[in-house]
């Protein structure tokens, strides 16, 4: 029972985590304009892995896709790759884990096969979670580096006469979604690996052995036993929020009620 619970919970946690990784990857707010200690602009810039957006005070929002592939920074490409690998591994892991679930009967699938599948999916979830965490962390590191570089030359201009606003970027919501989602996927993967131990058949069938004691003839015939160690878990099912991810390459929304102050 405990094995089923651990496996089921691991699956659900991983599912939420992978949904979060997908949401984070699609979100536009990976980096957002730093508003602290900055001239207050009437436009708000934010960027994602696939496009950059500008929201005006009027409420008009314009998003432009990164239509170049070669012109993009190597780090951004690496982050994209890590997130996609994380999603693909997670998706495969989910598919495998569905068939590995103890509560689902598929023909006459052996417990050993289910245990192997559970372990496989668990490892996939762990790698998926690590990929997401790595991707988000690389991006965050890139932001921190750029932030301090742009702070060093906050204003550039000719002889200090003409000033140019340096747009500094800070952590966007997608980074936090990505970290939480990656963590959940990782936890889910660990839970699946733990559940695998409980599913693995540890059978030791002892042959009947006759001991002939002097004066008595007693035969001991111990039956084969199955060791089932279940690890109960009271891990709460944490909810993460999705970002309103849009996938159009270029979007323009007209001035609307959602303008900011």
């Amino acid at each position: 029972m405990a094995v089923t619970a651990c496996q089921g919970l691991g699956f659900v946690v991983s599912l939420i985590g992978i949904a979060g990784i997908i949401a984070a990857t699609c979100m536009d707010q990976w980096s957002t304009q730093d508003l602290y200690n900055n001239p207050v602009t009437a436009v708000f810039n934010y960027q994602g892995l696939w496009r950059s957006c500008v929201r005006e005070s009027s409420g008009f929002t314009e998003c432009r896709g990164y239509f170049t592939l070669l012109g993009l920074p190597a780090m951004l490409q690496a982050v994209r790759a890590l997130m996609i690998v994380g999603i693909v591994l997670g998706a495969i892991g989910l598919l495998v884990s569905i068939f590995a679930l103890k509560c689902i009967r598929i023909g006459s699938m052996e417990d050993s096969a289910k245990a192997n599948m559970t372990l496989t999916s668990g490892i996939m979830f762990i790698v998926s979670g690590l990929c997401a965490i790595a991707g988000v962390s690389v991006f965050a590191n890139m932001l921190v580096t750029n932030f301090w570089m742009s702070t060093a030359n906050m204003y550039t201009g000719m002889g200090g006469m003409v000033q140019t606003v340096q747009t500094r970027y800070t952590f966007g919501a997608a980074l936090f979604v990505g970290w939480v989602a990656g963590g959940l996927t990782l936890i889910g993967g660990v839970m699946m690996c733990i559940a695998c131990r409980g599913l693995a058949p540890e059978e030791t069938n002892y042959k009947a052995v006759s001991y002939h004691a002097s004066g008595h003839s007693v035969a001991y015939k111990p039956g084969g036993f199955k060791a089932s160690t279940g690890f109960g878990s009271n891990t709460k099912n944490k909810k993460i929020y999705d970002g309103g991810a849009r996938t159009e390459d270029e979007v323009q929304s007209y001035p609307s009620k959602h303008d900011y102050v």
Epitope: Q47, E56, S57, P255
Partner: antibody
Framework: EVQLQQSGPVLVKPGASVKMSCKAS????????MNWVKQSHGKSLEWIGF????????RYNQKFKGKATLTVDKSSSTAYMELNSLTSEDSAVYYC???????????WGQGTLVTVSA | DIVMTQSPSSLTVTAGEKVTMSCKPS????????????LTWYQQKPGQPPRLLIY???TRESGVPDRFTGSGSGTDFTLTISSVQAEDLAVYYC?????????FGGGTNLEIK
Amino acid sequence: EVQLQQSGPVLVKPGASVKMSCKASGYTFTDYQMNWVKQSHGKSLEWIGFINPYNGGIRYNQKFKGKATLTVDKSSSTAYMELNSLTSEDSAVYYCATIYFGNSFANWGQGTLVTVSA
Amino acid sequence: DIVMTQSPSSLTVTAGEKVTMSCKPSQSLLNSGNQKNYLTWYQQKPGQPPRLLIYWASTRESGVPDRFTGSGSGTDFTLTISSVQAEDLAVYYCQNDYIYPYTFGGGTNLEIK
């Protein structure tokens, strides 16, 4: 057609307050910020601030903080601006204007002339 | 606050002539996020409220004759009227729409001979 109808001219004494209105029609009132602009006689324009009718968010030009108070009445699609502790410096034409692309002001009211005189 | 310097302050031309007026903000109005310049041009005729001509420094508002052209980037902007008409007699203002508080230039008063 978007229309902004402003209240009529007023003559007030120094130290008094005045509240002018700007009634919007021809569009959904809560969809656009309402900006207020001051134009002293024969002079340039000065931005006072804006109010977002959708959520009540307000931003003032620091120069007019404490001088102007912006409010809205969604039910009548009307924006209001109250000016207090009036002096001769406050004698001007005050315009309301809706925001547009590029944060520009597309539609303007006809203006309310405020004259501060003893 | 951004200071918007307009020049010339006044200008007298003959109908049909080409006119250019300048607007120089004290700070760049170019937003790196979308490479747009947040500068607007208005026309104000005597006794009337201002009228929007051009936003994003070069985008003409619908209904504005194509003789009006906005150009420039960063800290140097120009409004050009290719062939001045009698009805163009007005004061022209430029406005910073990028950094709060929004600020206007002193205006260029266009007079027709």
